[in-house]
């Protein structure tokens, strides 16, 4: 059956049940991850926003997919084998009572299930795997996958001493060229181009094929992981990282002092929450900040926003949007655009696309 | 590539009985789940019914239970829609379709047949 | 149950045009939405899945977006071979489908 080819897999917990603390579901969840990584080299990451690779849902009765839940008891919960779009996604029963204890029904056992199937498992017939196809439950605190579930696990994925290769670059070729991959941010430093996913960035020294992935914790150690946005004033030796209300100054590749600072001190009216994706034109001396599906254009040099913006980006960039992921300029008169998977060479004096490209086509994939 | 390929569809009177083939190639058959989807002459699409991978867990709309069974032979990698007590309304063009994935249904159609004419009438 | 409302049912427009077909859910289905096109006497086609993922091989011109309840599909710019029936899907439930003319 399908498995993912990445060892390293995102997750976002859509909404909450009522029945436990947001702090104890989001423990229960991370430590039914921990439960597989801890015995193959997979390594899980949450995030708050965007596509996640599983996607965790608590709903009841019918709720978007062919197999609805039946009310209290029977069915606790399904999850979806690895794939894109539904592919991966656990989804619990909000008629079952979730709990972090015995009564009830254990939110970490079954999750630790669930994900099983997210990664690819089918149903044991080993009573005692946790795989076992009915709940049972077991003091939570002296847990362990049995022989048949790790097993059956690493028959998918390896044992995890693969792990000590991450984030050696030869070992991140699955993740890298994934015809699913999308990014977060992306921008030019110099005569490199940054590619943020999660809390990594890929670098791709221009006209190399090589390209080398690493924790954006070691680079900048003050920085947070899934940064959303980013561009590049090279005549300034500047970068400008984004993520939620805040921004990083980079300059000479060193994080600034007194930073993080609020997006809003740009000129963003109050609402807007985050940017998408930015871009520098040294041509306009201008920056374009895209928000959902609009975009704002900044005046670099006078540092004030240009009159007459939002506009949709729909309007003004032929074939792109309704919402970008991310974007950068590069060759004098191209942006690249990033939507999901898809990659959209567009070239600004003509304005209009030139080339649709994966978005991981700089990687010789 | 992908092949899906439907037969077995004709004429019959109301209350008689058809069963429609599917044979499928150029993809791991016994993997994926697999559903029946139906046009009636001018009409829109509507969902006739699945089957998980295994054969086990089959789904079915309101208007075809009790009279449709849909099966499959993973052997000779061939879907089946088993349609009894026909009636008027059941006159359509039936497509086979495959799902994207397993073990649960995705509800995702990526690959559809050419698709068999059904006609009920007296 | 969950019931998916398509609009609109026709739609009359020209090559070069922008185009935005709507579909509404009447509860929550994540971005679990599907469009598909349809062309006379042939079979459906996938065009976006998970509501805004581009099916391999569709042109870039196709988009989709939404999640929760509302979503859409649009075409940047109408080619003659974009003239067809579109139809929003989720699990075992279509929209009505789209009509989409030559004005």
């Known amino acids: 059956g399908p498995v993912w080819r990445k060892h390293y897999i995102t997750y976002r917990i859509n909404n909450y049940t009522p029945d436990m603390n947001r702090e104890d579901v989001d423990y229960a969840i991370r430590k039914a991850f921990q439960v597989w990584s801890n015995v193959t080299p997979l390594k899980f990451s949450k995030i708050n926003t965007g596509m996640a690779d599983i996607l965790v849902v608590f709903a009841r009765g019918a709720h978007g997919d062919f197999h609805a839940f039946d009310g209290k008891g029977g069915i606790l919960a399904h999850a979806f084998g690895p794939g894109s779009g539904i592919g991966g996604d656990a989804h619990f029963d909000e008629d079952e009572f979730w709990t972090t204890h015995s009564g009830g029904t254990n939110l970490f056992l079954t999750a630790v299930h669930e994900i099983g199937h997210s990664l690819g498992l089918g149903h044991s017939s080993d009573p005692k795997a946790v795989m076992f196809p009915t709940y049972k439950y077991v003091d939570i605190n002296t847990f362990r996958l049995s022989a048949d579930d790790i097993r059956g696990i690493q028959s998918l994925y390896g044992d995890p001493k693969e792990n000590q290769r991450l984030p050696n670059p030869d070992n991140s070729e699955p993740a890298l060229c994934d015809p699913n991959l999308s990014f977060d941010a992306v921008t030019t430093v110099g005569n490199k181009i940054f590619f943020f996913k999660d809390r990594f960035f890929w670098l791709k020294v221009s006209e190399r094929p090589k390209t080398s992935v690493n924790l954006i914790s070691s680079l900048w150690p003050t920085l947070p992981s899934g940064i959303e946005a980013a561009y590049e004033i090279e005549a300034r030796n500047q970068v400008f990282l984004f993520k939620d209300d805040k921004y990083w100054l980079i300059s000479n590749l060193r994080p600034e002092p007194n930073y993080p600072k609020s997006i809003h001190s740009f000129g963003f009216p109050n609402f807007v929450k985050k940017i998408d994706a930015a871009v520098f034109n040294p041509r306009f001396y201008r920056t374009y900040f895209f928000v959902d599906n609009q975009y704002w254009r900044y005046d670099e040099r006078r540092q004030m926003m240009d009159p007459g913006y939002p506009k949709l980006i729909t309007k003004n960039f032929q074939g792109i949007g309704p919402k970008i992921d991310a974007v950068f300029y590069s060759k004098n008169k191209y942006y690249y655009f990033f939507q999901g998977s898809n990659q959209f060479e567009y070239d600004f004096l003509l304005q209009r696309i030139t080339k649709t490209l994966k978005s991981n086509s700089w990687f010789g994939c | 590539e992908v092949q899906l390929l439907e037969s077995g569809g004709g004429l019959v009177q109301p209350g008689g009985s058809l069963r429609l083939s599917c044979a499928a190639s150029?993809?791991?058959?016994?993997?994926?789940?697999m559903h029946w989807v139906r046009q009636a002459p001018g009409k829109g699409l509507e969902w006739v019914s699945g089957?998980?991978?295994?054969?086990?867990?089959?789904m079915y709309a309101d208007s075809v239970k009790g009279r449709f069974t849909i099966s499959r032979d993973n052997s000779k990698n061939t879907l089946y829609l088993q349609m009894n007590s026909l009636r008027a309304e059941d006159t359509a063009v039936y497509y086979c379709?495959?799902?994207?994935?397993?073990?649960?249904?995705?509800?995702?159609?990526?690959?559809w047949g050419r698709g068999t004419l059904v006609t009920v009438s007296s | 149950d969950i019931q998916m409302t398509q609009s609109p049912s026709s739609l009359s427009a020209s090559v070069g045009d922008r185009v935005t077909i709507t579909c509404r859910a009447n509860?929550?289905?994540?971005?679990?939405l599907n469009w598909y096109q349809q062309k006379p006497g042939k079979a459906p086609e996938l065009l976006i899945y998970?509501?805004?993922s581009l099916q391999s091989g569709v042109p870039s011109r196709f988009s989709g977006s939404g999640s929760g309840t509302d979503f859409t599909l649009t075409i940047s710019s109408l080619q003659p071979e974009d003239f067809a029936t579109y139809y929003c899907?989720?699990?075992?439930?279509f929209g009505q489908g789209t009509k989409l003319e030559i004005k």
């Open positions: 998970a509501a805004s």
């Open positions: 509860q929550s289905i994540y971005t679990y």
């Open positions: 089957i998980s991978p295994s054969g086990g867990p089959t």
């Open positions: 379709a495959k799902d994207i994935r397993g073990p649960y249904s995705s509800g995702l159609f990526d690959y």
């Open positions: 150029g993809f791991t058959f016994s993997w994926y789940w």
């Open positions: 899907q989720q699990a075992g439930i």
